[in-house]
């Protein structure tokens, strides 16, 4: 959490941002809140990015003002206009690109004063893994697949029964570049699995961590997966 204050003493307002991560090719949100004002027409929101000449986005007098917007953000940004009055200056960002990563500043002016806070925005690719029994294999084998990751993640297998066991010798992981030549498909195969056990395929890079679980018994197969973004710090 980053909390910023205006520079001029009594004319300062609190602005709060939260570091976040964007999934390239998808839409993202850069979070920013501020002390609300009672008049929308008195609120100015400016989003800036370190190293970028033009603005990322500007909202003033109750509407967008994009005359100074940098070309790289053209047609890709919006604030939640109906929520500005309650102090929400968060920015919607369409079709997140690797180059969108960096330090952003949320700068606010209201009738109470000014304030700003920085936000670190990471970009990469992350997706939910799916673990299945590979019936084509000669022995009992599990196959863990996740369609989109970047940067290249690590893949670790774990088991409920053999906690702490190292499965690197009985697993094989490959990374296949997707058609857009940035993200990669992750495929990991675990050999010599036993039934009545729960196995976990954990995929992690510096942006996200995802886990796919599979429980194999004689009568059924149960699957579960979840994904968690790393380093969501507020400012």
């Amino acid at each position: 959490l980053i909390i910023g204050f205006g520079i001029s003493g009594r004319h300062s307002i609190t602005v709060t941002t939260v570091a976040s991560a964007g999934n390239i090719g998808e839409d993202g949100i850069l979070s920013c809140t501020f002390e609300p004002d009672i008049k929308l027409s008195d609120i100015v929101i400016q989003w800036l990015k370190e190293g970028v000449l033009g603005l990322v986005h500007e909202f003033k007098e109750g509407k967008d003002e994009l005359s100074e917007q940098d070309e790289m953000f053209r047609g890709r940004t919006a604030v939640f206009a109906d929520q500005v009055i309650v102090g929400n200056a968060s920015l919607r960002l369409k079709n997140v690109q690797l180059t969108d990563a960096g330090t952003y500043k949320c700068y606010i002016i209201t009738s109470k004063g000014k304030g700003n806070a920085n936000l670190e925005y990471k970009t990469g690719a992350f997706s939910m893994p799916e673990v299945n029994v590979d019936y084509n294999a000669s022995s009992e084998t599990l196959r863990c697949e996740a369609p989109r990751w970047f940067p290249q993640p690590t893949v670790v297998w774990a088991s409920q029964v053999d906690q702490g066991a190292n499965f690197s010798e009985v697993s094989n992981t490959s990374f296949e570049l997707n058609s857009e030549n940035v993200t990669m498909k992750v495929v990991s195969v675990l050999y010599n699995v036993t039934i009545n056990n729960t196995y976990s395929c954990m995929i992690e890079n510096d942006i996200a961590k995802a886990t796919g679980d599979i429980k194999v018994t004689e009568s059924e197969i149960k699957r579960r997966s979840h994904l968690q973004l790393l380093n969501s710090k507020a400012s």
Epitope: D27, L66, G75, A78
Partner: antibody, heavy 120, light 107 residues
Amino acid sequence: QLQLQESGPGLVKPSETLSLTCTVSGGSIKSGSYYWGWIRQPPGKGLEWIGNIYYSGSTYYNPSLRSRVTISVDTSKNQFSLKLSSVTAADTAVYYCAREGSYPNQFDPWGQGTLVTVSS
Amino acid sequence: EIVMTQSPATLSVSPGERATLSCRASQSVSSNLAWYQQKPGQAPRLLIYGASTRATGIPARFSGSGSGTEFTLTISSLQSEDFAVYYCQQYHSFPFTFGGGTKVEIK
């Protein structure tokens, strides 16, 4: 409510420049949350996005037409214009102007369209 | 550029029946998709944006769904005024592109 109206010659000779103007009424072209776009539709075919302009004059063009297209704006007249140079018969189409959201980027409303025929 | 493919090209439906139109993108467009209706001699009219949000004044019988690469426009009970050509449009990345259209005709 906001209305858009295209105007310009309905017949253009091959190799010449097609020029159309879109007049916006019922609202200001300087409304900050919108771009102003051109879309065309050859007879019996689908829609092709040509490009857009912001009231400040910044433009973005479809790469397939970029070398031949110029879009300009006149805020004092509440108008924006399209010029397409070196036209051929393949440029024969109904040309529409439309308001384009800054994001989401949907087109609404549209002008009624004007048919431009390229023929000698 | 992103290629949008609509199917079927023509859909024959009786009034009062449900119509389901499909639109597929050559790569993910997230939810950055709009649907338009066009009647002969008229300009297209916005129906849906954001894949599922109805535009102002559009009847509830029109609904949109999908995300990524697969999208659907559903007309729950076709009225006589709904027979037209329908286009999908992606605005995920420049250049914005339209599908080839689906003509909904009276059966």
